[in-house]
C-alpha cells in the first residue's frame, strides 16, 4: 500500500477519506487505527457502528470520529481539534472476523496554526451555542508519499 499524506492545521479539524470497493467490502465494519512504530501493531482508535447497516452513523472516540458511506465506498475519519501529538501513521481498515484488511495507509501531518503568534485579543472563539465543527473549516490537503520517502524516522 502507498501512504497518503493528509495535512491539517493545529487546533482545527482534519478530514481523512479512504475510498474502497463497496462490493468487495460489503457487509464489513471499518476501523481507524494508529500504527505504533514502523513494524509495530496498529492500535484501534475508533470503529464504525456494531451493526453494519448503521455504519453511516458517526461514532466518536474522544476527538476522533468515523463514518462510512457503504454504498459510495468512502470511509471518512474526522480528527477534531488537531494537536501535534496526532501526527503519525494510521490505517483505514476493513474488518472481517478478527482480521483487518488495510484500505489505505495515512500519514497525518500537523501544521502550526498561523494564528498562534497573534495576541489573544485577536483570536475568535466560538460562543457557547456554536458547535466547534461549525466554527472551523476542515482542512484536508493530501498527497502520496514519494518513492523512497519513509513515514517513520530511521531507528538506530
Amino acid at each position: 500500500h502507498n501512504t497518503t499524506v493528509f495535512q491539517g492545521v493545529a487546533g482545527q479539524s482534519l478530514q481523512v477519506s479512504c475510498p474502497y470497493d463497496s462490493m468487495k467490502h460489503w457487509g464489513r465494519r471499518k476501523a481507524w487505527c494508529r500504527q505504533l512504530g514502523e513494524k509495530g501493531p496498529c492500535q484501534r482508535v475508533v470503529s464504525t457502528h456494531n451493526l453494519w447497516l448503521l455504519s453511516f452513523l458517526r461514532r466518536w472516540n474522544g476527538s476522533t470520529a468515523i463514518t462510512d458511506d457503504t454504498l459510495g465506498g468512502t470511509l471518512t475519519i474526522t480528527l477534531r481539534n488537531l494537536q501535534p501529538h496526532d501526527a503519525g501513521l494510521y490505517q483505514c481498515q476493513s474488518l472481517h472476523g478478527s482480521e483487518a484488511d488495510t484500505l489505505r495507509k495515512v500519514l497525518v501531518e500537523v501544521l502550526a496554526d498561523p494564528l498562534d503568534h497573534r495576541d489573544a485579543g485577536d483570536l475568535w472563539f466560538p460562543g457557547e451555542s456554536e458547535s466547534f465543527e461549525d466554527a472551523h473549516v476542515e482542512h484536508s490537503i493530501s498527497r502520496s508519499l514519494l518513492e523512497g520517502e519513509i513515514p517513520f524516522p530511521p531507528t538506530s
Epitope: 470497493d21 468487495k24 464489513r28 451493526l51 453494519w52 474488518l95 472476523g97 478478527s98 482480521e99
Partner: antibody
Amino acid sequence: EVQLVQSGAEVKKPGESLKISCKGSGYSFTSYWIAWVRQMPGKGLEWMGIIYPGDSDTRYSPSFQGQVTISADKSISTAYLQWSSLKASDTAMYFCARQRTFYYDSSDYFDYWGQGTLVTVSS
Amino acid sequence: DIQMTQSPSSVSASVGDRVTITCRASQGISSWLAWYQQKPGKAPKLLIYAAASLQNGVPSRFSGSGSGTDFTLTISSLQPEDFATYFCQQADSFPRTFGQGTKLEIK
C-alpha cells in the same frame, strides 16, 4: 439461481500440470470472493485460499502457498485452481465455494458450492 | 492456525431423536462459526452461520449456539434426510479451518 459449475474429473500423472475451473452464474461474479476447498478421500475439508474476481486479490492458506495458483477471469465469470507439477498426494475432491459476507457479524461463510472436481494423480 | 475439534466423531441415532454435536475452537472465535452438512458424493451445504443464524431454506429443527470456544449444533427431531456428515468452520481468522467432521448414522 446461483450456480457454481466445476470442470470434470481429471486423471493425471505425477509431475504433470493441471488447471481446473469453476464458473459462476445467477449472480454478480465480480462482487463475491470465491474459495477453493480440498477434501482428500474419506477426510475432512481444508481451506486452500480465496480470490476476489473483481480485482484478483488473492489469499492463500500457508499450507497451500506455493503449491497451487488461484486465478480468475472475470470476463467469463470463471475462477481457476492450478498446479504446475502434481503429486500423488494431490489426489482429492476440490470444491469451489462462494464466500458471502453476512452483515450481522461482518464475517464470511460459504453459501454456495460447486459440485466438486475429482483429481486423481497416479503413475 | 485455529484448530477446530468436533465431538463425537460419529453418532448413531433414530428418526425423531434429538441430537447434539459439539465443536471446540483452540482459541476464542467470538461467534464467527458456521455449520455445514455434507452427504456422500455431494458438496457441503451451509446450515448455520454466525454460530446461531439459520441459513435461508434450512429447516427450523436445526439450531446453533455458543460463543468463544464452545459451540453446539442441535437437530431437535431427526428426519431421514438428516443422516450425513456435519462440519463446523471458524470464520475468525485466516486460514479458515474446519472441524474433522461428525458422521450421523442411522441406529
